[in-house]
């Protein structure tokens, strides 16, 4: 670099350096300038920080005319405001440990960085920044309408939501439904909920629907066969009337149940479907409610616990009627 | 980094009980449910059984009567019992982490013979 | 008994296009399945690729797809490369428990 020449100064007043950029002069003496940080670009006109131990490395003697800023062995390292040694490692947060190594920081994440795709588990999991912890964990988000747990969640456990179906996808409106929630009654006439917005505003509405899981006036361990342990589906002998608040169906149902075991097992409806039933009530008025029909019954061993509903029996789904929720509401 | 292991026995007689052990790293036992999948030799994989980030479990009902899964958040260990082994059985055991089977172990070769 | 059903072999050229399908004997295939598919290529370990239909873990390329597709899961591999040669498992959820599918051997010539 040519010094020789007078000293020109693109400003007369001394440049801002950004914090924790030192203003030093120029290679001729004559001007004052940021100094050039680790790794960048720099010339006699434009040297290095000095007092982050950084050099302008001009590589081989060819090349004379720029350089990269170097640090020298040992230099020590500005960080956040603060000078850590060469060697030193330090938290420059909960979240990160960084080490000083010849005048270059190197910061490793001490969170996760994790992923989580959908389970049956997990069906919407996001991360969140809880109280009191440095780094965000994975939470499974559930229907806003789950918040009460009460005597409806006795028999069975929760029922998961079910992530966006891109064949679903309308205009403007991502079409969700939850899974049906199971049955308010282990046996008796109960009630079972989602949470969709397929409807014509997409606006979040709670469908509900009748179901009765078994009749509690059935003697079933009595069908249950020699030698075996359970029965999953027994047969209902003749067609049944349901009633509700004393109002009778006004039609007769051959309708499935889920059986009882004897070996400690339980038995949920597996696979379900919904259709409407007609009521006639004592006064003459006809009611239409959406009933619960189960096609099939599972037995397993995942029963309620006393003490936490959840423990068992939060991942076994009643697999309902969700590819067609869209047909009868 | 994520990573699970596999441990237990390399041969087993019939009729004795596999013991498998898979130890987590990377990641929380509360937070995440852990799978066990087999594989017997040259045949395709077979879902076993899984315990939920909740401590909950399920089975594949195949083997129902004779597997038990268990966990250990503390030491970050997923514990499978299979009763009554039988050659049938011989396969290599995984252990994979719930939430798209994304991480998977190496897994452990079982043999049963008398 | 419920039987997920793979292609057993696909062959593709490189930079072509192949779908991988899994079909569920017990009717169509739901996003309540949760369809997972999972890769091994030869001498690795598993990893999963896709999870909750169409959702890609990380190291998954964006030349993987997963979908619902005539009321079966599928894979589609656009543009594949030639690294994308894999045993490919898909796995679903029934309510209680996973079936695997018998896997599907994807060759990718040259």
């Known amino acids: 670099q040519d010094c020789s020449a007078q000293c020109q100064c693109a400003a007369e007043a001394a440049p801002h350096c950004p914090a924790g950029v030192s203003l030093v002069l120029d290679g001729c003496g004559c001007c004052r300038v940021c100094a050039k940080q680790l790794g960048e670009l720099c010339t006699e006109r434009d040297p290095c920080d000095p007092h982050k131990g950084l050099f302008c490395d001009f590589g081989s003697p060819a090349n004379r005319k720029i350089g990269v800023c170097t640090a020298k062995d040992g230099a020590p390292c500005v960080f956040g405001g603060s000078v850590y040694r060469s060697g030193e490692s330090f938290q420059s947060s909960c979240k990160y440990q960084c080490t000083c190594l010849d005048g270059a920081v190197g910061c490793v994440p001490l969170c996760s960085m994790d992923v989580r795709l959908p389970s049956p588990d997990c069906p919407f999991p996001r991360r969140v920044k809880l109280p009191g912890k440095c780094c965000e964990e994975w939470v499974c988000d559930e229907p806003k309408d789950r918040t009460a747990v009460g005597p409806a969640l006795a028999a069975y456990r929760l029922e998961d939501t079910f992530g966006p179906d891109p064949t679903m996808m309308r205009a403007n409106c991502l079409v969700q439904t939850t899974e049906w929630s199971a049955c308010s009654k282990t046996c008796g006439m109960g009630i079972s909920t989602r949470v969709t917005n397929d409807n014509t505003f997409c606006r979040l509405e709670k469908q509900s629907r009748l179901c009765m899981v078994r009749p509690c006036e059935a003697d079933l361990e009595e069908n249950i066969k020699k030698g075996k342990k359970c029965i999953r589906t027994p047969k209902i002998a003749k067609p049944v009337k349901f009633e509700l608040s004393g109002c009778t169906s006004v039609k007769t149902y051959r309708a499935k149940f889920c059986g009882v075991c004897t070996d400690g097992r339980c038995c949920t409806p597996h696979r379900t479907t919904t259709l409407p039933v007609e009521f006639k009530c004592p006064d003459g008025e006809i009611m239409k409610k959406n009933m619960m029909f189960i096609k099939t019954c599972a037995c397993h061993y995942n029963c309620p616990g006393d003490n936490d509903i959840f423990e068992s029996l939060y991942y076994r789904k009643m697999y309902g009627d969700m590819a067609h929720h869209h047909h009868h509401h | 980094e994520v990573t699970l292991k596999e441990s237990g026995p390399v041969l087993v007689k019939p009729t004795e009980t596999l013991t498998l052990t898979c130890t987590v790293s990377g990641f929380s036992l509360s937070t995440f449910g852990v799978h066990w999948i087999r594989q017997p030799p040259g045949k395709a994989l077979e879902w076993l059984a899984v315990i939920w980030r909740r401590g909950g479990t399920d089975y594949n009902a195949a083997f129902m009567s004779r597997l038990t899964i268990s966990k250990d958040t503390s030491k970050s260990q997923v514990v499978l019992t299979m009763t009554n082994m039988d050659p049938v059985d011989t396969a290599t055991y995984y252990c994979a982490r719930d939430g798209g089977f994304d991480y998977w172990g190496q897994g452990t070769t079982v043999t049963v013979s008398s | 008994e419920t039987v997920v059903t793979q292609e057993p072999s696909l062959t593709v050229s490189p930079g072509g296009t192949v779908t991988l399908t899994c079909r569920s004997s017990?009717?169509?295939?739901?996003?309540?399945?949760?369809a997972n598919w999972v890769q091994q290529k030869p001498g690795q370990a598993f990893r999963g690729l896709i999870g909750g239909t169409s959702n890609r873990a990380p190291w998954t390329p964006a030349r993987f797809s997963g979908s619902l597709l005539g009321g079966k899961a599928a894979l589609t591999l656009s543009g594949v490369q030639p690294e994308d040669e894999a045993e490919y498992y898909c796995a679903l959820w029934y309510s209680t428990h996973y079936v695997f599918g018998g896997g599907t051997k994807l060759t990718v010539l040259g």
């Open positions: 017990i009717g169509a295939v739901t996003t309540s399945n949760y």
